[in-house]
């Protein structure tokens, strides 16, 4: 939708004559008829397909035409159209003499025509006027014209409708090409989406107006990056919503039990971290190199039994050294010079040759382990039974005798709400008086541990000997890149360098 505008500027008819050459009496009272139509190579009479417009009497014989937008838009003349502008046109402008006040075509004698001009060509939509002058033997007409789009229409053809708005359906103004230009603070195809406060957490926060940051349930703070603890939590905090991680000196599911042993007695030695683990009980987390209930004992590097195949360990100032029994060598006596011919497998283990007899492997009977089947399996050493269950060795297997209220292979299940295993991803289920609560493993959060969150597996500095730690984001595990001279999954073993 748009408007073809024609601005008449000057008409010259010095002799005051009609097209027939007959003079007007007393002078040529001149008005104009304009016909706008589709492009024709030769402009011919016929329907004015794009519209027509007539003026009142504008002057006598020769006159200049004043701009007059106030009087109903008389000059420039307006020819509105309700279609896509084709870019080409034909224009016919006729000057007529009005003997009386009735300007209708049927009220005028046919020889009242003063002059007729016809032009055709290309015309692009734009604000600039095109100036033209048409001359005949007796008259001259100077005029200019242009095509502009109607309000809310844009583009090369006035075919793009765009109406600026600032409401629920959009917040934008229109560019000259009809594309939307969002108001400050808004984005999206129709500028309906507010731009939240800078730094507002992408998952935990949202906004309903620009520069706002509203938090989803369970999150708080200016940027929605702080969690809210569980409703029943008393003396605790959280790292994910609805958790209740107890403050120092407090215990219980809702951190409402006063457990001040650490604060009152400071039992942990050698810079260890003390954690209250129950009423009047505590746990010391030792710094590297210390052990014991209260971390009171200095740890020998040989205590981890690094020497294999019966090798004996000797502490050294900068680590340890393995003295290997006959037939074994290597940093941890892990390599064997024996073969099956030496009957190296104990406790009824069967020997299998490897590498054309250069090496061997022992297949151990039940209850025995070690590279030579030299160790008796104690399946209870790892304390597999949870919730105070008692571990019993039963020949080649083990079983847990559970305390009342618990069940499962390892007494890990609370008999009641937790029986249906509601906690996902290995979350631990706790029965409450009414309901249950899940304690999630690292990397998971949510009411039922259903939400996977990225964790930094390197945060605990698991790599030794100045190795570089990398986090594998797909599995939330770490990989240690060892410096020269060290091996092991944590770069914990020095290599015997030549």
């Amino acid at each position: 939708s748009g408007v073809f505008q024609l601005q008449l500027q000057e008409f010259i008819n010095e002799r005051g004559v009609l097209a027939s050459g007959r003079p007007c009496e007393p002078g040529c009272r001149t008005f104009f008829r304009v016909c706008l139509k589709h492009f024709q190579a030769v402009v011919s009479p016929g329907p004015c397909t794009f519209g027509t417009v007539s003026t009142p009497v504008l002057g006598t014989n020769s006159f200049a035409v004043r701009d007059d937008s106030s009087g109903g838009g008389r000059n420039p003349l307006q020819l509105p159209f309700n279609f896509t502008w084709p870019g080409t046109f034909s224009l016919i402008i006729e000057a007529w003499h009005a003997p009386g006040d009735d300007l209708r075509p049927e009220a005028l004698p046919p020889d009242a025509l003063i002059s007729k001009i016809a032009i055709q060509g290309s015309l692009a939509v734009g604000q600039n006027w095109l100036l033209d002058e048409q001359t005949s033997t007796l008259t001259r007409l100077r005029y200019s014209y242009r095509v502009i789009c109607s309000d809310n229409y844009y583009g090369d053809n006035c075919s793009r409708l765009c109406k600026k708005r600032n409401d629920h359906f959009g917040h934008y103004v229109c560019q000259p090409d009809g594309n939307l230009s969002c108001l400050p603070g808004w984005t999206g195809e129709y500028c309906q989406q507010p731009i939240c406060l800078s730094g507002c957490h992408e998952q935990n926060g949202y906004c309903s107006k620009p520069a706002e940051c509203l938090c989803r349930p369970g999150w708080q703070g200016r940027l929605c990056n702080e969690c809210i603890p569980h409703n029943g939590c008393r003396h605790g905090t959280c790292s994910t919503p609805w958790q209740c991680t107890c403050d120092e000196g407090w215990g219980g599911l809702f951190c409402d039990q006063d457990l001040n042993y650490c604060t009152h007695h400071s039992p942990c030695k050698n810079g260890a971290t003390c954690s209250n683990s129950g009423q009047r009980s505590y746990t010391c987390t030792c710094r590297p190199g210390y052990t014991g209930v209260d971390c009171e004992l200095e740890l020998s590097e040989c205590d981890s039994n690094p020497c294999r195949n019966g090798g004996s360990c000797k502490d050294q100032e900068d680590g340890y050294h393995c003295l290997c029994p006959p037939g074994y060598y290597g940093l941890h006596c892990e390599h064997s010079t024996l073969s099956c011919a030496d009957s190296p497998c104990f406790n009824g283990g069967s020997c299998r040759e490897r590498n054309q007899g250069a090496n061997y492997a022992c297949e151990c009977p039940p209850n025995f382990t070690g590279s030579n089947c030299e160790k008796k399996v104690d399946r209870c050493t790892s304390n597999p039974c949870a919730n105070g269950g008692q571990c019993l060795n039963r020949g080649p297997s083990r079983m847990c005798r559970c305390r009342p209220g618990f069940t499962g292979t390892y007494c890990e299940l609370h008999v009641s709400d937790c029986a249906r295993n509601p906690c996902a991803h290995g979350g631990t289920c706790h029965d409450l008086e009414n309901g249950l609560m899940c304690t999630c493993p690292a990397g998971f959060s949510g009411r039922r541990c259903e939400v996977r969150t990225s964790i930094d597996a390197c945060a605990s500095s698991p790599c030794f000997n100045r190795a570089t730690c990398y986090t594998d984001l797909s599995t939330d595990t770490f990989v240690c890149n060892c410096p020269y001279g060290f091996v092991g999954s944590r770069c914990e073993f020095p290599v015997g360098l030549p």
Partner: antibody, heavy 118, light 107 residues
Framework: EVTLRESGPALVKPTQTLTLTCTAS????????MAWVRQPPGKGLEWVAT????????YYRDSVKGRFTISRDNSKNQLVLTMTNMDPVDTATYYC???????????WGQGTTVTVSS | DIVMTQSPDSLAVSLGERATINCRAS??????LAWYQQKPGQAPKLLIY???NLADGVPDRFSGSGSGTDFTLTISSLQAEDVAVYYC?????????FGGGTKVEIK
């Protein structure tokens, strides 16, 4: 036991200022977001304002924005609501509650009556 | 703002009988709904959160159900001490909004 105790009742004139104080005990006050909720006489509950525990971010219902200010003093375990340019429509029982705008209000004070009348 | 509509406005139930209160949200609030009990002259008390989780110390005759826009509070066997006004509240969208309340009396 969790206890929230609001300061005593008050009668104020329109346009005047009133400050309510809530003193908390039985939980680690600094760990939890807090709120004020009010109840006009014979009517239902309406949330008034909230303050976070982490950074003290505040939020208000539209009708009190610019007039009410919520703040907290963690060292004193106190929540404060300062109400300026008070209007008779602010007449209500004001409750101090533990919670945010996006979590349940787990614990409530006994409430204090505020009457705005000339 | 989300409008919470409770029904009925009041409810008279015989002792030991079941009482059911409904709450409807004007748009989806998922399961982020709480129920409160307010006895005459007292402050409100949290009964249920996240639609169906009982708050600490609440008797198990109270239960909640629903999701999205329609929610229900049920008292399976009404006791004399349950006479109160019950309010629902959504905390999914800002600002939090309460229902108008349902008064529960003994028939």
């Amino acid at each position: 036991e969790v206890t929230l105790r609001e300061s005593g009742p008050a009668l104020v004139k329109p346009t005047q200022t009133l400050t309510l104080t809530c003193t908390a005990s039985g939980f680690t006050f600094s760990n939890f977001p807090m709120a004020w909720v009010r109840q006009p006489p014979g009517k239902g509950l309406e949330w008034v304002a909230t303050i976070s525990s982490s950074d003290g971010t505040t939020y208000y219902r539209d009708s009190v924005k610019g007039r009410f200010t919520i703040s907290r003093d963690n060292s004193k375990n106190q929540l404060v609501l300062t109400m300026t340019n008070m209007d008779p429509v602010d007449t209500a029982t004001y409750y101090c509650a533990r919670g945010y705008y996006n979590s349940p209000f787990a614990y409530w004070g006994q409430g204090t009556t505020v009457t705005v009348s000339s | 703002d989300i409008v919470m509509t409770q029904s009925p406005d009041s409810l008279a139930v015989s002792l030991g009988e079941r009482a059911t209160i409904n709450c409807r949200a004007s748009e989806d609030i998922y399961s982020n709904l709480a129920w409160y009990q307010q006895k005459p002259g007292q402050a409100p008390k949290l009964l249920i959160y996240d639609t169906n989780n009982l708050a600490d110390g609440v008797p198990d005759r109270f239960s909640g159900s629903g999701s999205g826009t329609d929610f229900t509070l049920t008292i399976s066997s009404l006791q004399a001490e349950d006479v109160a006004v019950y309010y629902c509240q959504q905390y999914n969208n800002y600002p939090p909004t309460f229902g108008g309340g349902t008064k529960v009396e003994i028939k």
